[in-house]
């Protein structure tokens, strides 16, 4: 049969509230050389137990008997501590345990979980989580909103999870744990009301360099929105703005609108260029969300001035012509020049030169019109730019290079069709 | 000496449950934790649960939580595990083992075959 | 869980060499046990507490290491060493065991 256990005193009973100090302690009698002392909870060895041995000799000799007493420190008092606690040996060829020890906790409630500050969209639900424990059990839950109790009682309204269909102002909720030993009170969560995301963000009007934009806004529930702010950027080729994200990819232009009405002007825009916008209305408690990127476009425009260095030489019955692409915003795709040319007395000739920047004209009646000029216009999709000042037809001097190029000749009606255009401004000078 | 004696192998169907028992000697049975290791053909070792059988207190491993029951008889120093709802993976050796922080002693090992 | 790792699963040794099981922790642990199952017998305690001798095992078995990495040794292998070597932990809930060592005498 077994030796007799060498414990002559055995760990006893803790039970408190959270954070209690408390010791657990053991004492063998041993003969010999005496033994560490480890301490089970819950038949585990504690390997980082806050242990104290203390071994006081019995007589003179090492062979003679020992105390040996072990103290179990519990600092802080945590259910991770509870359990049954026992002294454990190991001696010669044989295992002792102590009679075991129970640690236990006992105390007004634990909060887990607890209602945290947010912001939510006016007349939008959303959910607050609140959990407590004890022991002892059971731990009833009850919500308050503006310190006002949802329930007649603790345990018979929602627990750990309240859902609130809606708010139409900023309110506070907090949440009372009740036990056998008492309440406790959780922090004071605030949510804030914050105004709808607008919707329907929608182009109004559109021009070269400036696009009218209006939304409808969200509700704000007691809170008059004061301003929207609406954001446009560059759209990259499309790269970087996806529907949902987030930032844009470079410093976006801010622009804010009074509000009524939910509309606004952006100008100071590049013509025919690919923008994301996107807006978001602020009251008094703050920014809505803003709605998604809204991919948009200015259209093309005009040229916005005449093509540059226009020289005109005549030689004999053929006149050279050439010039430069405007300095001037084209406000689109160049798609070509048309050239003007006419007589003191003769009707004016209009011709569409395409992509070139010269040409070579030949005049009918051998060069015998007098005060011939010629006015030079650059085109985009959306219609001419403005003509040139007329340039008159210097003669030609010897030694000045002409280059060969196909001749244009002059029609015997002025009339033309324009095959690719079908708008254009007419000209007379 | 230490020893813990089994009870025999058994058989049975799948949905049925089985009831192994472990009978210690040799040293005080309430002082020490009884636990139940299950090893499958060619497998490894899986820990099930403890008891205490001092107090009656028992610890399951989560995996048999809702099947298994740890039981002790303290007057016949005997422990018992009982498994419902057995399926054929359940087919295994079933070991008690003393534990003092480690599994210092084992039983000689039951063998439930799970079959329909 | 912790899930213990041991190396290798399978070896083949001839008496009187030295044999190493390792086995490795997927986090750190205090203490590591140690057990012996011979074919058709109950694992047997082998070393407890990382490096002491369980009651009647030889001393050419020992124990050794820290934190994630702990070690076996078999000094000097006798044929009645064949058996397969588990590796266990109970520093967290709950108590796992490694896969086992499969040790073959040639």
């Known amino acids: 049969q077994a030796e007799e256990s060498p414990f002559v005193g055995n760990p006893g009973n803790i039970t408190g509230a959270r954070g209690l100090t408390g010791t657990l302690r053991c004492q063998l009698q041993v003969q010999g050389e005496p033994p560490e002392v480890h301490w089970l909870r819950d038949g585990q060895i504690l390997e980082l137990a806050d242990s104290t041995q203390t071994q006081v000799p019995l007589g003179e000799d090492e062979q003679d008997d020992w105390i040996v007493v072990s103290q179990l420190r519990i600092t802080s008092l945590q259910l991770s501590d509870t359990g049954q606690y026992q002294c454990l040996v190991f001696l010669g060829h044989q295992t002792f345990v102590s009679q075991p020890g129970y640690v236990g906790l006992e105390g007004l409630p634990y909060f887990l979980e607890e209602p945290e500050d947010r912001t939510v969209a006016a007349n939008t639900p959303f959910n607050l989580s609140c959990q407590a424990q004890g022991p002892p059990e059971p731990v009833d839950l009850l919500w308050l909103q503006d310190a006002v109790p949802l329930a007649t009682a603790p345990g018979h309204g929602p627990q750990r999870s309240l859902h609130v269909p809606g708010l139409n102002k900023t309110s506070s909720f907090s949440c009372e744990a009740h036990n056998a030993k008492g309440v406790t009170t959780s922090r004071t969560a605030t949510i804030t009301v914050l105004p709808q995301q607008p919707r329907n963000l929608h182009l109004v009007s559109r021009q070269p360099t400036e696009l009218e934009v209006a939304w409808t806004p969200g509700l704000s529930g007691i809170y008059p929105l004061t301003h929207c702010t609406l954001q446009a950027v560059l759209s990259d080729d499309g790269m970087g703005i996806q529907a949902g994200e987030p930032d844009p990819p470079e410093e976006p232009l801010t622009s804010q609108a009074s509000v009524p009405p939910h509309q606004l002007r952006l100008g100071s825009l590049h013509p025919h260029t690919p923008y994301h916008i996107r807006v978001a209305c602020t009251s008094s408690q703050g920014p809505s969300s803003w709605t998604h990127w809204l991919p948009v476009e200015t259209p093309e425009g005009v040229p916005l001035g005449p093509p540059e260095n226009i020289s005109a030489t005549r030689n004999g019955s053929q006149a050279f012509v050439h010039w430069q692409e405007p300095r001037a915003p084209l406000q689109g795709t160049l798609l070509g020049y048309r050239l003007a040319y006419q007589g003191q007395d003769t009707p004016e000739v209009l011709m569409d030169i395409g992509l070139r920047q010269e040409v070579t004209l030949e005049l009918q009646g051998d060069g015998s019109v007098s005060n011939l000029t010629v006015c030079v216009a650059a085109y985009t999709a959306a219609g001419d730019g403005p003509w040139s000042l007329p340039v008159p037809l210097e003669a030609w001097r010897p030694g000045q290079a002409q280059p060969v190029h196909q001749l244009v000749k002059e029609p015997s009606t002025p009339a033309f069709s324009w095959p690719h255009h079908h708008h254009h401004h007419h000209h007379h000078h | 000496q230490v020893q813990l004696v089994q009870s025999g192998a058994e058989v049975k169907k799948p949905g049925a449950s089985v009831k192994v028992s472990c009978k210690a000697s040799?040293?005080?049975?309430?002082?020490?934790?009884i636990n139940w290791v299950r090893q499958a053909p060619g497998q490894g070792l899986e820990w099930m649960g403890w008891?205490?059988?001092?107090?009656?207190?028992?610890k399951y491993n989560e995996k048999f939580k809702g099947r298994v029951t740890l039981t002790v008889d303290t007057s016949i120093s005997t422990a018992y595990m009982e498994l419902s709802r057995l399926r054929s993976d359940d087919t295994a050796v079933y070991y008690c083992?003393?534990?003092?922080?480690?599994?210092?002693?084992w039983g000689q090992g039951t063998l439930v075959t799970v079959s329909s | 869980e912790i899930v213990l790792t041991q190396s290798p699963d399978f070896q083949s040794v001839t008496p009187k060499e030295k044999v190493t099981i390792t086995c490795s922790a997927s986090?750190?642990?205090?203490?590591m046990y140690w057990y012996q199952q011979k074919p058709d017998q109950s694992p047997k305690s082998l070393i407890y507490?990382?490096?002491n001798l369980a009651s009647g095992v030889p001393s050419r078995f020992s124990g050794s290491g820290s934190g994630t990495d702990y070690t076996l040794t078999i000094n000097s292998l006798e044929a009645e060493d064949a058996a397969t070597y588990y590796c266990?932990?109970?520093?967290?809930?709950?108590?796992?065991f490694g896969q086992g060592t499969k040790l073959e005498i040639k």
């Open positions: 083992a003393r534990s003092t922080g480690f599994f210092d002693y």
């Open positions: 040799g040293y005080p049975f309430t002082d020490f934790y």
């Open positions: 008891i205490y059988p001092g107090s009656g207190n028992t």
């Open positions: 986090s750190s642990i205090g203490y």
């Open positions: 507490l990382t490096s």
């Open positions: 266990q932990q109970w520093s967290s809930n709950p108590p796992t």
